[in-house]
């Protein structure tokens, strides 16, 4: 949904959320381009790109939250994701440098689409919370309570270490989105009913 617009139709909104999470768990949209741009596309280096434990809530944790708690957790986590993605973007090569290196500019464009897409998902999470009459969530167009911050990336002058941290974060992000999609897939046909 575009800024500020909320569908009042539960099934339509749930469908949008499922579609968005399906796209966001697809590694070809974010992790794979990041690996190529950062020169990590070598088997030995790929081995080091593992999800950091505890960086994102597990599927088990998400399932145990109930709808409102799940949406609140998702909203807060997406807030952190927006910051981490912006942080990654700051340290990506510039378009002209990519062209000089013979790397694909489309990979950079994919990476730069991630944040607006997360914003769109977060807006729909807010809309769903409104539909479920959850008054505890901050409207996405206004500043709200500070979202819990993730562990700050370890300050390091090691550019390679930073690249690996980015890679680990993105792997965790895709896994998290897969878990979110699975939770949404269990939601019932109406706001008042859940399939078990």
């Amino acid at each position: 949904a575009a800024m500020g617009s909320c569908s009042k139709e539960y099934r339509m909104l749930l469908g949008q959320l499922q579609k968005q999470t399906d796209l966001m768990q697809d590694t070809s949209r974010l992790l794979d381009p990041y690996i190529r741009i950062q020169g990590l596309d070598i088997p030995k280096l790929r081995e080091h790109c593992r999800e950091s434990p505890g960086a994102f809530p597990s599927e088990e944790t998400l399932r145990g939250l109930g709808r409102r708690g799940f949406l609140q957790t998702l909203n807060a986590t997406l807030g952190r994701v927006l910051h981490r993605l912006a942080d990654l973007e700051q340290h990506l090569p510039k378009a002209q440098d990519l062209e000089r290196s013979g790397l694909n500019i489309e990979d950079l464009e994919k990476l730069q689409m991630a944040r607006p897409n997360v914003l769109g998902l977060r807006n729909n999470v807010y809309c769903m919370a409104q539909l479920l009459d959850n008054s505890d969530m901050t409207e996405p167009t206004k500043a709200g309570r500070g979202t819990p911050q993730p562990p700050t990336p370890t300050p390091t002058s090691d550019v390679f270490q930073r690249k690996l941290e980015g890679c680990s974060f993105l792997r965790g992000y895709h896994r998290f989105m897969h878990s979110v999609g699975r939770v949404f897939s269990k939601w019932g046909e109406s706001p008042n009913r859940s399939r078990r």
């Epitope: 944040r115 500043a143 500070g146 979202t147």
Partner: antibody
Framework: EMQLVESGGGLVQPGGSLRLSCAAS????????MSWVRQAPGKGLEWVAT????????YYLDNVRGRFTISRDNAKNSLYLQMNSLRAEDTAVYYC??????????????WGRGTLVTVSS | DIVMTQSPDSLAVSLGERATINCRAS??????????MHWYQQKPGQPPKVLIY???NLESGVPDRFSGSGSGTDFTLTISSLQAEDVVVYYC?????????FGGGTNVEIK
């Protein structure tokens, strides 16, 4: 009334350091990302740096990264800009601004009146 | 970095007439249904003041003679009926990516 008041500006020699402060009042400071924006005399506006609400994330203009450090103390409702290795081109009025809107896609809705930094020998 | 080109640099308009300021981005500042473009007014010796946020939303307390439109790379700030207090400098700002960048400014004068 929401207010931002900058201090710490002044005349400094090239290569020198200065620390700007911004005191916030009238709103819940810890709920907002904050930024520094500068304006060279008679020129346009230039974004310099932003810090997230909790202080964990910082974003910088390329030509100040490594020289400037943005920080905050939420307990004191204060924002800071530590400026090292200052250059003549850093001469400007430095404004403290509150960030609102979509996370990481903010705009600035409350501004201080600015503090003048002059870098000259 | 995204370069914001504002036009014209200076604009002379009669009081009560329409003033139109344009801002062109070197690449799109819109994505996923969002327009990350904002407009500011700056009076001499004062800090900037937000007029329009996210391309078309009027900031609270701003007169409704100000409006914004556009998407992608081209955006417009319109003052439907110029008042004496509107004769100042206007800037566009994008927040699509870091670094956020401002346009060079448009000085509005009375014809």
């Amino acid at each position: 009334e929401m207010q931002l008041v900058e201090s710490g500006g002044g005349l400094v020699q090239p290569g020198g350091s200065l620390r700007l402060s911004c005191a916030a009042s009238g709103f819940t400071f810890s709920n907002y990302a904050m930024s520094w924006v500068r304006q060279a005399p008679g020129k346009g506006l230039e974004w310099v740096a932003t810090i997230s609400d909790g202080g964990s994330f910082t974003y910088y203009l390329d030509n100040v990264r490594g020289r400037f450090t943005i920080s905050r103390d939420n307990a004191k409702n204060s924002l800071y800009l530590q400026m090292n290795s200052l250059r003549a081109e850093d001469t400007a009025v430095y404004y403290c601004a509150r960030d609102v809107g979509h996370t990481t896609f903010w705009y600035f809705d409350v501004w201080g009146r600015g503090t003048l930094v002059t870098v000259s020998s | 970095d995204i370069v914001m080109t504002q036009s014209p640099d200076s604009l002379a308009v009669s009081l009560g007439e329409r003033a139109t300021i344009n801002c062109r981005a070197s690449k799109s500042v819109s994505a996923a249904g969002y327009n990350f473009m904002h407009w500011y007014q700056q009076k001499p010796g004062q800090p900037p003041k937000v007029l329009i946020y996210y391309a078309s939303n009027l900031e609270s307390g701003v007169p409704d003679r100000f409006s914004g439109s556009g998407s992608g790379t081209d955006f417009t700030l319109t003052i439907s009926s110029l008042q004496a207090e509107d004769v100042v400098v206007y800037y566009c700002l994008h927040s699509r990516e870091f670094p956020f960048t401002f346009g060079g400014g448009t000085n509005v004068e009375i014809k």
